[in-house]
C-alpha cells in the first residue's frame, strides 16, 4: 500500500498546510488559511458533487432528453447525478444512457431468449428443431410444434423453424 501522505484522508495540501476537503454536495469557495477553515457552499438546484472535493464548480445534473427517448429513472440530488433510462419499448445505446433505440424484434425463425430492458436490447435465438416462430416480435419465444399424436392426429406437413406442423386425420384402415 502507498505510504500515508502529509495530509489526512478528506484533506488536501495547499501552500504548506492541510485543508479540509468539501463534503459531497458542496463546492469550494475558499481554501483554509493558518487562521481560517476551508469555506464550502452547497451546490445549487440541478447541480451535484458526489465526492469529498476541492472543486470550485458543481457538476450539472444529466438532462434526460425526451427527444432522444429518455426519461428520468432517478432524480439527482446535491450528491448524486440524475439517472436516465429509456421509454417503454426502447433501450440505452451505451452504459451512460445518452440516447435510446427501439428494442430489436426477433425475425420469424428466431425467438426471444431475453426480453429487452431499459438498458439492454432483446436477445434472440434461433428456434431449435421442434420449435418455431412465425412472427417478428420483441416478446415471443419459440413455440413447440403441435403434437399431432396427443390429438390423435398425424403429421400431414412437417414443421420448420418458421412454421408449425400441420396435423390431419389418420387414414382409415380398410377391411
Amino acid at each position: 500500500p502507498e505510504p500515508p501522505t502529509a495530509c489526512r484522508e478528506k484533506q488536501y495540501l495547499i501552500n504548506s498546510q492541510c485543508c479540509s476537503l468539501c463534503q459531497p454536495g458542496q463546492k469550494l469557495v475558499s481554501d483554509c488559511t493558518e487562521f481560517t477553515e476551508t469555506e464550502c457552499l452547497p451546490c445549487g438546484e440541478s447541480e451535484f458533487l458526489d465526492t469529498w472535493n476541492r472543486e470550485t464548480h458543481c457538476h450539472q445534473h444529466k438532462y434526460c432528453d425526451p427527444n432522444l427517448g429518455l426519461r428520468v429513472q432517478q432524480k439527482g440530488t446535491s450528491e448524486t447525478d440524475t439517472i436516465c433510462t429509456c421509454e417503454e419499448g426502447w433501450h440505452c445505446t451505451s452504459e451512460a444512457c445518452e440516447s435510446c433505440v427501439l428494442h430489436r424484434s426477433c425475425s420469424p425463425g428466431f425467438g426471444v431468449k431475453q426480453i429487452a430492458t431499459g438498458v439492454s436490447d432483446t436477445i434472440c435465438e434461433p428456434c431449435p428443431v421442434g420449435f418455431f416462430s412465425n412472427v417478428s416480435s420483441a416478446f415471443e419465444k419459440c413455440h413447440p410444434w403441435t403434437s399431432c399424436e396427443t390429438k390423435d392426429l398425424v403429421v400431414q406437413q412437417a414443421g420448420t423453424n418458421k412454421t408449425d406442423v400441420v396435423c390431419g386425420p389418420q387414414d382409415r384402415l380398410r377391411a
Partner: antibody, heavy 116, light 107 residues
C-alpha cells in the same frame, strides 16, 4: 517566538549517510507541517519533501524520494532528514521550515559537505 | 513541474528607491505565490504569502501583487537592511518550486 534550530555542519564520506535534525520550539509541533529544502552552492532553492509531525505522513519531490527520508520525534519536537548514498552532488545547505501559509519560519540551514 | 522564472538575476538600486522584482509561473498558480528574503549570511525569512499578504513582523514597505502567472514584489523605500536575494515560490501544486532568485545590491 517560533524557532527552528538545525544541527551543525557535517563533513561526510561518499557512499555514507547523514541525518540532519531540526528542533522546533515556540509553537505546537504537531499542528504544522515541516518542509525540507536544499540549496547547492551558488544556486537557488529546491524542495525535497514535507512531513506531518502529527501523523508521520510524507510527500516527497520525486527527484529526492530515493535520497531523503523524513521522520519526526514528537516527544522532542524534532524533525529529521536522513540522506543516503551521498555523492559530491549532495554537498549543499539543507533547510527545514515550518509550514502554515508558505514556508513561514526557517531553520538556519545545515551545511553538508561530501568529500573523500 | 511548475517553473518559476525570475528574469532579473541581479538588480542595483539606491537607498530610498522603489524596487520591483518579478516572477512568472509556467501555469496559473491561483495566487499561491510566496516571497522570501535570503540575507548574505544565509538566513531566510518569509515576506509575503498568497501574493499580497504580509507575514507577521515584516515591514509595510514590502508589498506583493499579481494573478494568474505574473507576480511581483515591491519594496517602496529601499533600506540598507533590504540588501539580500529574493526568491518566489509557488504553493499551488506539488512539487513546490522556487524561482532562481534576484540579488538586490546598492548602487
Amino acid at each position: 517566538e517560533v524557532q527552528l534550530e538545525q544541527s551543525g555542519a557535517e563533513l561526510v564520506r561518499p557512499g555514507t549517510s547523514v541525518k540532519v535534525s531540526c528542533k522546533a520550539s515556540g509553537y505546537a509541533f504537531t499542528n504544522y507541517l515541516i518542509e525540507w529544502g536544499i540549496q547547492r552552492p551558488g544556486q537557488g532553492l529546491e524542495w525535497i519533501g514535507v512531513i506531518n509531525p502529527g501523523t508521520g505522513g510524507t510527500n516527497y519531490n520525486e527527484k529526492f524520494k530515493d535520497k531523503a527520508t523524513l521522520t519526526t520525534d514528537k516527544s522532542s519536537s524534532t524533525a529529521y532528514m536522513q540522506l543516503s548514498s551521498l555523492t559530491s552532488d549532495d554537498s549543499a545547505v539543507y533547510f527545514c521550515a515550518r509550514g502554515g501559509s508558505g514556508f513561514a519560519y526557517w531553520g538556519q540551514g545545515t551545511l553538508v559537505t561530501v568529500s573523500a | 513541474d511548475i517553473v518559476l522564472t525570475q528574469t532579473t538575476s541581479s538588480l542595483s538600486a539606491s537607498l530610498g528607491d522603489r524596487v520591483t522584482i518579478s516572477c512568472r509561473a509556467s501555469q496559473d498558480i491561483n495566487n499561491y505565490l510566496n516571497w522570501y528574503q535570503q540575507k548574505p549570511d544565509g538566513t531566510v525569512k518569509l515576506l509575503i504569502y498568497y501574493t499580497s499578504r504580509l507575514h507577521s513582523g515584516v515591514p509595510s514597505r514590502f508589498s506583493g501583487s499579481g494573478s494568474g502567472t505574473d507576480y511581483s514584489l515591491t519594496i517602496s523605500n529601499l533600506e540598507q537592511e533590504d540588501i539580500a536575494t529574493y526568491f518566489c515560490q509557488q504553493g499551488n501544486t506539488l512539487p513546490w518550486t522556487f524561482g532562481g532568485g534576484t540579488k538586490l545590491e546598492i548602487k
